[in-house]
């Protein structure tokens, strides 16, 4: 109960990581994160 956690993301495909509450698809190279996804394994909003 006391240990830290490094949650992995069990999502289809690659490039998902925990951003905020959810596992989100990261932004492509050259883009930056505007907003994280709002559902499990969702797409971040990138600019």
């Amino acid at each position: 109960q006391g240990g830290t956690r490094s949650p992995r993301c069990d999502c289809a495909g690659d490039f998902h990581k925990k951003i905020g509450l959810f596992c989100c698809r990261g932004c492509p190279a050259g883009h930056y994160l505007k907003a994280p996804c709002t559902e499990p394994c969702g797409n971040s909003t990138c600019l």
């Epitope: 830290t4 956690r5 949650p7 992995r8 999502c11 951003i19 509450l21 559902e39 499990p40």
Partner: antibody, heavy 122, light 111 residues
Framework: EVKVVESGGGLVKPGGSLKLSCAAS????????MSWVRQIPEKRLEWVAA????????YYPDSVKGRFTISRDDARNTLYLQMSSLRSEDTALYYC???????????????WGQGTSVTVSS | DILLTQSPASFAVSLGQRATISCRAS??????????IHWYQQKPGQPPKLLIY???NLESGVPARFSGSGSGTDFTLNIHPVEEEDAATYYC?????????FGSGTKLEIK
């Protein structure tokens, strides 16, 4: 022993403000996402705010967006809920809840405090 | 928002029998291979207690007489055999998307 203890509830007039606190112990607070959930006696539970661990993203339902602000102080192992522009419908028992840990985020809430009561009335 | 409808609202079950509680979602709560439904038990004057997460996973310390099943929009919590201490209100919750919502609750009484 994992423990979360809420405080700060009370009687406030409509339009007023209140700040709730939740003191956590028995686990590495900074590693867990946290939520506030409220309940009108004998009624449905309503999730009102969440904050992520590490990057501190915050989330709210439309019913409280712009009026409530969730925050955390990992150094003090404390979660907060700043409530403003309070309405009579915000009257409820407010629970602090830890999101379940594990290999990946699951968003179930595994430890809850006893709650702190908020009454909005003139 | 996803609406969770629980049935029945309340019922009574004899000691040792099976109790079945239904939770129906207004849209699918399944994605990425998981069904994002969780079950809680709440007794009067106490906070909710997590029983089952992700539809069928028993939380640590919860007796094996509790089980969960379902997929898509229809989910079930089973308690068998029912014991006196199981008298409580049971809630389902989804985490498929924001906002997280809870069912309206099912009150279980023991005969």
């Amino acid at each position: 022993e994992v423990k979360v203890v809420e405080s700060g509830g009370g009687l406030v007039k409509p339009g007023g403000s209140l700040k709730l606190s939740c003191a956590a112990s028995g686990f590495v607070f900074s590693s867990y996402d946290m939520s506030w959930v409220r309940q009108i006696p004998e009624k449905r539970l309503e999730w009102v705010a969440a904050i992520s661990s590490g990057d501190y993203y915050t989330y709210y339902p439309d019913s409280v967006k712009g009026r409530f602000t969730i925050s955390r102080d990992d150094a003090r192992n404390t979660l907060y809920l700043q409530m403003s522009s309070l309405r009579s419908e915000d009257t409820a028992l407010y629970y602090c809840a830890r999101h379940r840990g594990g290999n990946y985020p699951q968003y179930a809430m595994d430890y809850w405090g006893q709650g702190t009561s908020v009454t909005v009335s003139s | 928002d996803i609406l969770l409808t629980q049935s029945p609202a309340s019922f009574a079950v004899s000691l040792g029998q099976r109790a079945t509680i239904s939770c129906r979602a207004s849209k699918s709560v399944s994605t990425s291979g998981y069904n994002y439904i969780h079950w809680y038990q709440q007794k009067p004057g106490q906070p909710p207690k997590l029983l089952i997460y992700l539809t069928s996973n028993l939380e640590s310390g919860v007796p094996a007489r509790f089980s969960g099943s379902g997929s898509g929009t229809d989910f079930t919590l089973n308690i068998h055999p029912v014991e006196e201490e199981d008298a409580a209100t049971y809630y389902c919750q989804h985490s498929r998307e924001l906002p997280f919502t809870f069912g309206s609750g099912t009150k279980l009484e023991i005969k």
